[in-house]
């Protein structure tokens, strides 16, 4: 019996199309596939960022695969050909591995890259990123921000920089059409007359960095003798009510502090006959239905009511 062998894929490479971390892995069929014309050859692809513990494994019939990577680190990938058992009258046959690596040659020392990069998607409408210059860089250093997400045909540069002393320290983004629920890639690079500047790469999803506006129109009604209903309205903007979770801070007579999280725009509070005054503030965040994470809004303006006045209103009604 002659042992069945198959060659690894040819021309395996990692291609950078300039999308700031979204890379193409591509290859050609192995040599000498003539013996297996009736067979559907598959490929097992493994890839990871260098330094990562685990490989991502994909089995595909295609000759390419695309995914996002962290370009602050190198990338390694390997691939081999799989002949299913149907083709070999027995067990699956695997070729040896073909390997490929990719990294961007780092310029400058790590300290020159931007520090404390922070991006917030205000009210699911306006994206703003800010950073601090690298350690020990001179005032002649300037940073430039580029971004890309699936739907753009190329990476775009920021056109509205936030500047301090002529130095770019942030970016106000334009309206970003169809940009949520997908990876959003950013590169901040820099230039200086005196020394090379290290680039930095960031990836996140916009729905996970939303900071809503605070809730508005806080009201308070007495439902019964010892029950108070607190109500508020969702903030203006594109975020639907079902996407909010709220945190309420309630103060009774400047002593008791209750903090609770609720899903709806109402909260019923039990009070005692000793309660004289009631104050509350509310803040909002995008909930688990609409994001994996989020940023709490600022607190609403504080609203206070005298319980006696509420009771009078209730009795009148």
């Amino acid at each position: 019996d002659t042992e069945i062998k198959v060659n690894p894929p040819q021309d395996f490479e990692i291609v950078d199309p300039g999308y700031l971390g979204y890379l193409y892995l591509q290859w050609q069929p192995p040599l000498s596939l003539d013996n297996f014309k009736e067979c559907t050859v598959e490929y097992e692809l493994k890839y990871r960022n260098i330094g990562s513990e685990t490989w991502t494994t994909i089995i595909t019939k295609n000759l390419h695969y695309k995914d996002g990577f962290d370009l602050n680190k190198g990338i390694e990938a390997k691939i081999h050909t799989l002949l299913p058992w149907q083709c070999t009258n027995g067990s699956e046959v695997q070729s040896s591995w073909a390997e490929a690596t990719y990294w961007i040659s780092p310029q400058g020392i790590p300290e020159t890259k931007v520090q404390d990069m922070d991006c917030v998607y205000y009210n699911w409408q306006y994206l703003l990123c800010s950073w601090k210059p690298g350690i020990g860089v001179l005032l002649d250093t300037n940073y430039n921000l580029f971004y890309w997400y699936e739907g753009l045909d190329r990476a775009l540069q920021c056109v509205d920089y936030i500047k301090v002393d002529g130095q770019n320290i942030g970016c106000r983004f334009p309206y970003l059409e169809s940009s949520d629920y997908k990876d959003f890639y950013i590169c901040v690079n820099g230039s200086s007359e005196t020394k090379p500047i290290r680039s930095s790469y960031f990836t996140f999803q916009l729905q996970n960095i939303v900071k809503p506006l605070p809730p508005v129109c806080l009201t308070c009604t007495q439902e019964s003798l010892y029950e108070i209903k607190l109500k508020w309205s969702i903030p203006l903007g594109p975020i639907p009510a079902r996407c909010f979770v709220y945190e309420i801070e309630i103060r009774e007579d400047d002593t008791t502090l209750v903090t609770t999280t609720v899903e709806n725009e109402t909260y019923t509070l039990k009070i005692t006959n000793e309660t004289r005054q009631l104050c509350f503030v509310v803040r909002s965040k995008v909930n688990i239905y609409c994001s994996d994470d989020g940023i709490w809004s600022e607190w609403s303006d504080k609203q206070c009511w005298e319980v006696e006045e509420l009771l009078k209103k209730t009795l009148l009604l």
């Epitope: 949520d180 629920y181 729905q207 996970n208 975020i239 639907p240 079902r242 996407c243 909930n287 688990i288 239905y289 609409c290 994001s291 994996d292 994470d293």
Partner: nanobody, 115 residues
């Protein structure tokens, strides 16, 4: 039209376990979160657990440590594993799949905890 179908409810003794499933007829799981709610007779509907599209979870204090929510996006199905059930867990359990564009509810499945 997307539909959600709960299953796995039934009668169980205190201390027992049940696993509820919520199957969606369309592929709406990818970017949407899902939650399990319950409503006992004469009480308001309350959320017992929720899971984001990326797998972050939240639980009501009354079920923390006993219930586990999970999801299988490939199968368009969500699950609620309920252990150490108590009589006060008796209710109709509903699943909800929602997001910025969508909001779908199932018809509910009855869970009764009684000896």
């Amino acid at each position: 039209q997307v539909q959600l179908q709960e299953s796995g409810g039934g009668l169980v003794q205190p201390g027992g376990s049940l696993r509820l499933s919520c199957a969606a007829s369309g592929s709406i799981f990818n970017t949407n979160g899902m939650g399990w709610y319950r409503q006992a007779p004469g009480k308001q509907r309350e959320r017992v657990a929720g899971i984001s599209s990326g797998g972050n979870t939240v639980y009501a204090a009354s079920v923390e440590g006993r219930f586990t929510i999970s999801r299988d996006n490939a199968k368009n199905t969500g699950y609620l594993q309920m252990n150490n059930l108590k009589p006060e867990d008796t209710a109709v359990y509903y699943c909800r799949v929602a997001g910025r564009q969508d909001d779908y509810w199932g018809q509910g499945t009855q869970v009764t905890v009684s000896s």
